[in-house]
């Protein structure tokens, strides 16, 4: 076909962005291109063309009219991780092609097993108490908070400090005694450690 004066090659006007998403959740990688004639859009993951509903109606990935890639649910198994990777969209017309910036799709996870559960502690009243915990492996890296007798601890209280995986109570009182649970949390959800008992005895 003859080159028309008003025709121009594709250019990407909206690039996809990095995303971290939970398994089973929907997400979208955006891509928008301009060009005349209107460019066709294809997506590539780690250099390999991505199949969408245009190729297989049963696919969990849909190519939207805008060119964005919509995931009905993020699929992520113990071994197979078909959605995780580095994506680019490619816009093509007869005058050429344009490639977007890379966008990584990472799948958030939060394992069940704590790397370190807190253990029972016995202290004398007035002494400091330290409970330690390492949350389960996760992505993004889990943060932690603590519960005493199932109620979240307010670390703004001056005797209590939480640093890393350590809960430190200075100048313990009888009222500090109870069952302490470490909670690991990220965008996937929360995991409770095994409870540990703090016993405070009078000298």
């Amino acid at each position: 076909s003859r080159l028309r004066q008003e025709d121009f090659p594709p250019r990407i006007v909206e690039h996809p962005s990095d995303v971290i998403v939970s398994k089973g959740e929907p997400t979208t990688l955006n891509c928008k291109a301009e060009g005349r004639p209107t460019p066709t859009i294809e997506w590539y993951k780690d250099g390999e063309r991505v199949e969408t509903d245009k190729d297989d109606p049963r696919s969990h990935r849909m190519l939207l009219p805008s060119g964005s890639l919509f995931f009905l649910r993020i699929v992520h198994g113990r071994r197979s991780k078909p959605d995780e990777g580095s994506y680019v969209c490619v816009a093509r017309n007869y005058l050429g092609e344009a490639v977007s910036r890379n966008a990584s799709l990472e799948v958030a996870l939060l394992r069940d097993d704590f790397r370190q559960n807190p253990t029972d502690v016995v202290v004398a009243a007035g002494e400091p108490a330290i409970l330690e915990c390492q949350p389960p492996r996760g992505h993004p890296e889990p943060t932690i908070y603590w519960k005493k007798d199932k109620v979240r601890i307010d670390d703004k209280e001056e005797r209590i400090s939480i640093r890393g995986g350590k809960l430190m109570i200075s100048n313990t009182r009888k009222s500090d005694a109870g069952m302490y649970t470490c909670v690991g949390t990220n965008m996937v959800g929360e995991r409770d450690s095994d409870p540990a008992e703090l016993t405070v005895f009078e000298r």
Epitope: E51, G77, S80, P82
Partner: antibody, heavy 118, light 105 residues
Framework: EVQLVQSGAEVKKPGASVKVSCKAS????????MHWVRQAPGQGLEWMGW????????EFPQKFQGRVTMTRDTSITTAYMDLSRLRSDDTAVYYC???????????WGQGTMVTVSS | DIVMTQSPSSLSASVGDRVTITCRAS??????LNWYQQKPGKAPKLLIY???SLQSGVPSRFSGSGSGTDFTLTISSLQPEDFATYYC???????FGGGTKVEIK
């Protein structure tokens, strides 16, 4: 259409090797682990191992270690299973199977009959 | 290694019957349990994954239940095309059960 197409039947002598191929199409080859499963005549299913097409990493049960090799060629989206030092009890149908992101074998090849006979 | 024990190894049933097949793991596998159907001369077909999720395109008369070590596949009303061999598989270490052959009574 998502499918796995395997190479044809083989007849081998004891002590020889066999290489079975599995051509994948209709999906992102590097996104899914490929497994090999065999079935002796009249017997059940036996898992032989997996390959991660993305990096070529493999894992096999103890029984097959040292005798099975799994490789892949990403340029032609094909996985291979090589079994050496064949014995008569290796006579079986050999299947490749894709492991889905739901941890199950959702797509299977049609099977390759390997007969080991002197 | 995790050993999967299926029972019974075979059963006879009639069209319309409710059929139950059990699978026991030698240690806890949470819900990492799949069920397959195989007909003579054919490759296995995935029916149920993650213990109770029905694979796309599989009739709703098939259902799975259980977690930990004990699992069940139920066919609510057996159809002529359901006469086949059924296998459970754990997807932690990937071993299969010995199979259950469902025959016509």
């Amino acid at each position: 259409e998502v499918q796995l197409v395997q190479s044809g039947a083989e007849v081998k002598k004891p002590g020889a090797s066999v290489k079975v191929s599995c051509k994948a199409s209709g999906y992102t080859f590097t996104g899914y682990y490929m497994h090999w499963v065999r079935q002796a005549p009249g017997q059940g299913l036996e898992w032989m191992g997996w390959i991660n097409p993305k990096d070529g990493d493999t894992e096999f049960p103890q029984k097959f270690q040292g005798r099975v090799t799994m490789t892949r060629d990403t340029s032609i989206t094909t996985a291979y299973m090589d079994l050496s030092r064949l014995r008569s009890d290796d006579t079986a149908v050999y299947y490749c199977a894709r492991e889905s992101g739901d941890d199950a074998f959702d797509i299977w090849g049609q099977g390759t009959m390997v007969t080991v006979s002197s | 290694d995790i050993v999967m024990t299926q029972s019974p190894s075979s059963l006879s049933a009639s069209v319309g019957d409710r059929v139950t097949i059990t699978c026991r793991a030698s240690q806890s596998i949470s819900s990492y349990l799949n069920w397959y159907q195989q007909k003579p001369g054919k490759a296995p077909k995935l029916l149920i994954y993650a213990a109770s999720s029905l694979q796309s395109g599989v009739p709703s008369r098939f259902s799975g239940s259980g977690s930990g070590t004990d699992f069940t596949l139920t066919i609510s009303s057996l159809q002529p095309e359901d006469f086949a061999t059924y296998y459970c598989q754990q997807s932690v270490g990937l071993s299969f059960g010995g199979g259950t052959k469902v025959e016509i009574k």
